[in-house]
Interface confidence: low
Amino acid sequence: PPRGRILGGREAEAHARPYMASVQLNGAHLCGGVLVAEQWVLSAAHCLEDAADGKVQVLLGAHSLSQPEPSKRLYDVLRAVPHPDSQPDTIDHDLLLLQLSEKATLGPAVRPLPWQRVDRDVAPGTLCDVAGWGIVNHAGRRPDSLQHVLLPVLDRATCNRRTHHDGAITERLMCAESNRRDSCKGDSGGPLVCGGVLEGVVTSGSRVCGNRKKPGIYTRVASYAAWIDSVLA
């Protein structure tokens, strides 16, 4: 099943997020992803947990998953590189780099997104954009077109309250508010963009969505700058 969803958001402006990727398994949307270099897409490690013998591909330049669009192109994956410390039963290090079979053809609808390298937290209250093709309501309706929502960053101390995520949010993770508007299963691997820069990747742990006491959890890319650089080198 797809991992993650955008709840309480709206349809995104077509092709206004040219970095957005759909990670697909056997031709169906599985997870979000973000183009970080011409031949590399960043996503979440847990996305491929159940992909064992399936065919993993990356769709770039898409707004609609089903409709023909001039900019759309499906790329095979040459290499999948999960973070070496990612583990099935934890949300830590939930990052995956996918090397495309060839360099993506760049254009107005396909372009890498700059990612944050300075390991400083985004200020609480900052509005950040998260986008994805995950389901849009609790009944499980899947959108055909890309959805997005603006979410305020939540401070770690609040996110770590016993009533919230009870200490699980370390310095390599960040939270965003989840009061009716949220990311969740299926948007995993997608980008959290603050001020035009990739700051976080939607984690793919199971979590109730749209509940303000269970904020969205995002992997902070700046904490993994060394690893990302080493893989892309």
């Epitope: 583990q87 937290d121 009870d166 699980a168 370390t170 310095e171």
Partner: antibody
């Protein structure tokens, strides 16, 4: 008051293993990474790795990945480091240390244990 | 890995003097530098983070500065209790790495 109480000194033979403990008190054990740092005269301070006590997730310095294994026991607020296949190069003082946050950002090691001296000698 | 270099292993000073300890990173670490003090027989103690922010309880005679690859810890008026080893550390990216240390001695 935050305290990290480490186990006592160890004298071990080459090829043997040792398990060092670090008992935390005075703060929420699961809210902060626990780090381990090696101090030797030859190489100064070296970060070995860290563990998220809430989830058990670990990150290792590649130089220590084959040497150290980090675990925690949440029920007793204790972190452990297991060192294997010891050689004389592993003789050092080993510290546990919690991360420090400022503005919710990691900025170094604020609280340190008193250190555990490991001596590897035949 | 980012290499942190403290070029002076030893520095001699007198009580009341101003002294500066330097540290150079092998790449730009965007002010993500911490400084520690370690006295004989004790554990390291955090003094400074983000290059210039003093940790709680650290006397204001300790100041940090720098940007890019070059960082400095300055003690404006050295006291006898400041005689210790001082280490820089980058908190920019893992693996977190330390400088080799600078030992502050009394002339």
């Amino acid at each position: 008051e935050v305290q990290l109480q480490q186990s006592g000194p160890e004298l071990v033979k080459p090829g043997a293993s040792v398990k060092i403990s670090c008992k935390a008190s005075g703060y929420s054990f699961t809210a902060y990474y626990m780090n381990w740092v090696k101090q030797s005269p030859e190489k100064s301070l070296e970060w070995i790795g860290d563990i998220n006590p809430s989830t058990g997730g670990t990150t290792y310095n590649q130089n220590f990945k084959a040497k150290a294994t980090l675990t925690v026991d949440k029920s007793s607020s204790t972190a452990y480091m297991h060192l294997k296949s010891l050689t004389s190069e592993d003789s050092a003082v080993y510290y546990c240390a919690t991360t420090y946050y400022s503005g919710n950002s990691y900025v170094g090691f604020a609280y340190w244990g008193q250190g555990t001296l490991v001596t590897v000698s035949a | 890995d980012i290499v942190m270099t403290q070029s002076h292993k030893f520095m001699s000073t007198s009580v009341g003097d101003r002294v500066s300890i330097t540290c150079k990173a092998s790449q730009d670490v965007s002010t993500a530098v911490a400084w520690y003090q370690q006295k004989p027989g004790q554990s390291p103690k955090l003094l400074i983070f983000w290059a210039s922010t003093r940790h709680t309880g650290v006397p204001d005679r300790f100041t940090g500065s720098g940007s890019g690859t070059d960082y400095t810890l300055t003690i404006s008026s050295v006291q006898a209790e400041d005689l210790a080893l001082y280490y820089c550390q980058q908190h920019y990216s893992t693996p977190w790495t330390f400088g080799g240390g600078t030992k502050l001695e009394i002339k």
